[in-house]
Amino acid sequence: SPCPQAWGPPGVQYGQPGRSVKLCCPGVTAGDPVSWFRDGEPKLLQGPDSGLGHELVLAQADSTDEGTYICQTLDGALGGTVTLQLGFPPARPEVSCQAVDYENFSCTWSPGQVSGLPTRYLTSYRKKTLPGAESQRESPSTGPWPCPQDPLEASRCVVHGAEFWSEYRINVTEVNPLGASTSLLDVRLQSILRPDPPQGLRVESVPGYPRRLHASWTYPASWRRQPHFLLKFRLQYRPAQHPAWSTVEPIGLEEVITDAVAGLPHAVRVSARDFLDAGTWSAWSPEAWGTPSTGPLQDEIPDWSQGHGQQLEAVVAQEDSPAPARPSLQPDPRPLDHRDPLEQ
């Protein structure tokens, strides 16, 4: 066939509204004169004496030109049928990346503009290297590699086994039959880290203490607990119908609220963040509710908190003691403002 096959379904050719469009008769030899008709219409659009050979030229195509065309050879034989579809070349996709743990991240994208044409995305990434490798061949360990697209979630790819301290460049290229357009994004896991909210939040009264509530929770399931990468927590609580939250930063995985309003139900929620302040705070957990005990005041410490100090100590020791000090996070040496950015 003299017609180059654009990416997309067979038999379809593509053009841009407002531009000149050339349709190509697929079943003839290049340059052979043909006649062109709209499918189902007897009127000749372009005769074999046009001097355009096997091509039909539509000046300033618009939506009325979309549809199926038929080309015929000089002897009346069918040269082929062509469907014209109009749309736009890709614009640079908008890309963002996020991480819910310290060794994997995902990137999502959306089209910069709707092209109206069949579209696919090519996704890849590489580890950025420090300058100064004049004498060294680039290591295969820096990539590039494909960023595998999520079969269940369109417009998302996932990088597994990323290094927390490295910087990666993501390449998302939108491809359609009229061209391709690329967006690049540089990401550091430590900057895009946002844990999932803590799970299993429970709020319980403390028998004999009408102003106390005991809240406990667990790490999010997506955060593989490992001594080098701990989470810290922020807890908020408020009595029912009260507009303002009180905030505390607990140590470990529980907190005793000591200034609850007696007799009133309280909403409690908790959020998590890398313990060295990498990235941002998670979303808040779903609220849990609890009402302080209404029983008589007790002088004695209730059983559950007997040795509460040791329990907390044990949690902290278990999580903190094996952790070698991570280097403090350096501020990103990035633009101080966004004047005159280089267009991607």
Partner: antibody, heavy 126, light 112 residues
Framework: EVQLLESGGGLVQPGGSLRLSCAAS????????MGWVRQAPGKGLEWVSY????????GYADSVKGRFTISRDNSKNTLYLQMHSLRAEDTAVYYC???????????????????WGQGTMVTVSS | QSALTQPPSASGSPGQSVAISCTGT?????????VSWYQQHPGKAPKLLIY???KRPSGVPDRFSGSKAGNTASLTVSGLQAEDEADYYC???????????FGTGTKVTVLG
């Protein structure tokens, strides 16, 4: 070895044209910003032109805008500089250079040229 | 696209320190942390010494250091050695071409 090798320089008359090439090896060329920097005899460095990794965006110094065109062929790991309407003041050593750049969600920024070629001399004279 | 301003020359004896300034505007040096420094020996291609204001590429001795205050960046060469005699250029992102601009260059002479 990470390397850039320029070629295509030479003697050309004022108003003439020349095409410089820069062959890259030892790194994934298609992922890097590339640029041309020139240095007139006995003078300082002057930024000439740059190109985005995919080739989709380019930029030029005012002194060459409209006369020079930068392009790249990622399948051949080669950077080009097509120069038209050459003037005596375009006489210089032309260096090809690599930049990793930095890309935020809104824009890309040139950072630093970490790899340089050895340069090719362009002389514009009658 | 005005070049960044550097002193034409600087000198020092072996073992001493020399500092080179690079003055731009809030649209280039002052507006971004993309300031780099290059060393160029006669007849050779430039070599990257400092990038992103303060960072040293692998293989560059720690005698070379960079800093920035406002619209002025500085390169300091401490413990001067004979091989440090060269031309030094600063560069910054943010010229009016949205790409980069070089400094006027400073010739460093190692005395004695």
């Amino acid at each position: 070895e990470v390397q850039l090798l320029e070629s295509g320089g030479g003697l050309v008359q004022p108003g003439g044209s020349l095409r410089l090439s820069c062959a890259a090896s030892g790194f994934t060329f298609s992922w890097y910003f590339m640029g041309w920097v020139r240095q007139a005899p006995g003078k300082g460095l002057e930024w000439v032109s740059y190109i985005y990794p995919s080739g989709g965006s380019t930029g030029y110094a005012d002194s060459v805008k409209g006369r020079f065109t930068i392009s790249r062929d990622n399948s051949k790991n080669t950077l080009y500089l097509q120069m038209h309407s050459l003037r005596a003041e375009d006489t210089a050593v032309y260096y090809c250079a690599r930049d990793e750049g930095y890309c935020s969600s809104t824009s890309c920024y040139f950072d630093a040229f970490d790899i340089w070629g050895q340069g090719t001399m362009v002389t514009v004279s009658s | 696209q005005s070049a960044l301003t550097q002193p034409p020359s600087a000198s020092g004896s072996p073992g001493q320190s020399v500092a080179i300034s690079c003055t731009g505007t809030s649209s280039d040096v002052g507006g971004y942390n993309f300031v780099s420094w290059y060393q160029q020996h006669p007849g050779k291609a430039p070599k990257l010494l400092i990038y992103e204001v303060t960072k040293r590429p692998s293989g560059v001795p720690d005698r070379f250091s960079g800093s920035k205050a406002g619209n002025t960046a500085s390169l300091t060469v401490s413990g001067l050695q004979a091989e440090d005699e060269a031309d030094y250029y600063c560069s910054s992102y943010g010229g009016s071409n949205n790409a980069g601009v070089f400094g006027t260059g400073t010739k460093v002479t190692v005395l004695g």
